[in-house]
């Protein structure tokens, strides 16, 4: 008795974080014996889509010409060969940005901060949200991910940094989201430039390991040190 068919690989071009309205292609790569490919989306009727293989039959293309909320979510794919269906692929999480209006990002007491002192980045949304993400530009992943407890919704989240070093300097943005779908993010806030002056250098924060689903740039996210975040929000390190 032959073992189970090997699982296919599933990936997205140009990647798995897509702005509203932009196109995305989902690829499923199996074997040369594949006769059909199936794409399933979590919490949607299965199969979500079926495609015949492209020559030489080892992959199929699933095209999304214009990203909307409906396409955001968690996908798996399978292929069918003469001996049956394969194991499912590892999941692909397709995230959409632009689902909600952009939050406002500010720095307290000021975006100009002396090394060794403290600063708090404040992300504020117009409507109540329960998840806030802080991004350092050109880093691939959120620095901080704050989610409210018990679904309590907030208009803001605080991201304290203390003590500040030169590593904290740079351009930041934040996103907001609802917990019922972490695949949907707001438009990004306008950028905030954090300028660190002075020579009171503390220890450099060590980068966190970045696990990339979308193939991220080489700069790794830095984890701001700091005190307890905004009341009612839990800190999640990404």
């Amino acid at each position: 008795q032959a073992g189970p068919l090997p699982k296919p690989t599933l990936w997205a071009e140009p990647g798995s974080v897509i702005s509203w309205g932009n196109s995305v292609t989902i690829w499923c790569q199996g074997t040369l014996e594949a006769r059909e490919y199936r794409l399933d989306k979590e919490e949607s009727p299965a199969p979500w889509d079926r495609q015949n293989p492209l020559e030489p039959k080892n992959k199929a293309r699933f095209s999304i010409p214009s990203m909307t909320e409906d396409y955001a979510g968690r996908y798996r794919c399978y292929y069918r060969s003469p001996v049956g269906w394969s194991q499912p692929s590892d999941p692909l999480e397709l995230v959409m940005t632009g689902a909600y209006s952009k939050p406002t990002l500010s720095a307290l007491p000021s975006p100009l901060v002396t090394s060794g002192k403290s600063v708090t980045l404040l992300c504020q949304s117009r409507s109540p949200m329960d998840t806030f993400l802080l991004i350092k530009e050109r880093a691939a992943h959120p620095l901080l991910h704050l989610r409210s407890e018990h679904g309590a919704q907030q208009h803001q989240a605080e991201f304290p940094m203390s003590p500040v070093t030169s590593v904290h300097g740079g351009t930041y943005r934040c996103f907001s989201s609802h917990g019922f779908s972490h695949y949907l993010l707001s438009h990004p806030s306008d950028p905030l430039e954090l300028i660190v002056s002075g020579s009171l250098e503390g220890p450099r924060p060590s980068p966190t390991r970045s696990v990339s689903t979308a193939a991220g740039p080489e700069d790794q996210p830095l984890m701001p040190t700091g005190s307890v975040p905004h009341s009612g929000l839990r800190r999640h390190w990404e």
Epitope: T9, V17, N22, T25, E137, P188, G216, P217
Partner: antibody, heavy 123, light 107 residues
Framework: QVQLQESGPGLVKPSETLSLTCTVS????????WSWIRQPPGKGLEWIGY???????NYNPSLKSRVTISVDTSKNQFSLKLSSVTAADTAVYYC?????????????????WGQGTTVTVSS | DIQMTQSPSSLSASVGDRVTITCRAS??????LAWYQQKPGKVPKLLIY???TLQSGVPSRFSGSGSGTDFTLTISSLQPEDVATYYC?????????FGQGTKLEIK
């Protein structure tokens, strides 16, 4: 700082297989899309194909029947094999990385390139 | 497959001129377009990605615009060191086709 270096024979005989390796230093191959591009003398750039760090591949349809790109994550290398070469395959061959996604900026193009290696197909 | 067409194929301009190169995709590619500069005998260099984002370290006289099918690379004030061939490339979905290139010379 990530750097790429192509290696392989500079001369290949017609009908044989061209084999090149790209070594990634200063960073991990375990992310990103890794591409091969070539440029025949006096001509433009031609995308050959990519391999995703997971091993998934896509190739230029005009070369698909002759191309294989593979990855060896343990050696931080990816490789190109082009079979049944002719004089038309004479070119400078580049390896390159397509950078990833940056929130607020979008998807990068090919931000890191090797220096290129000249391959001549001749008997 | 989507074709990428650049125009003009070559152009000559004076130092200080504003230079525009266009790239047209045969189908929509959202903003998944990059521009590269290749100086004679050198490796291509990424200038612009996501249609309009300037790559780190690239002079601000370079800018990109467009979305969908029509894209533009602009050099606001041409400098002697800008002599090169410029290529656009789509990367929305394989194949990641390049344009045929635009050779830029100084008058």
């Amino acid at each position: 700082q990530v750097q790429l270096q192509e290696s392989g024979p500079g001369l290949v005989k017609p009908s044989e297989t061209l084999s090149l390796t790209c070594t990634v230093s200063g960073g991990s191959i375990s992310s990103y899309f890794w591409s091969w591009i070539r440029q025949p003398p006096g001509k433009g750039l031609e995308w050959i194909g990519y391999i995703y760090y997971s091993g998934s591949t896509n190739y230029n349809p005009s070369l698909k029947s002759r191309v294989t790109i593979s990855v060896d994550t343990s050696k931080n290398q990816f490789s190109l094999k082009l079979s049944s070469v002719t004089a038309a395959d004479t070119a400078v061959y580049y390896c390159a990385r397509r950078g990833g996604y940056s929130y607020g900026y979008g998807y990068y193009g090919m931000d890191v390139w090797g220096q290129g290696t000249t391959v001549t197909v001749s008997s | 497959d989507i074709q990428m067409t650049q125009s003009p194929s070559s152009l000559s301009a004076s130092v200080g001129d504003r230079v525009t190169i266009t790239c047209r995709a045969s189908q929509g590619i959202s903003n998944y377009l990059a521009w590269y500069q290749q100086k004679p005998g050198k490796v291509p260099k990424l200038l612009i990605y996501a249609a309009s984002t300037l790559q780190s370290g690239v002079p601000s006289r370079f800018s990109g615009s467009g979305s969908g099918t029509d894209f533009t690379l602009t050099i606001s004030s041409l400098q002697p060191e800008d002599v090169a061939t410029y290529y656009c490339q789509k990367y929305n979905s394989a194949p990641w086709t390049f344009g045929q290139g635009t050779k830029l010379e100084i008058k």
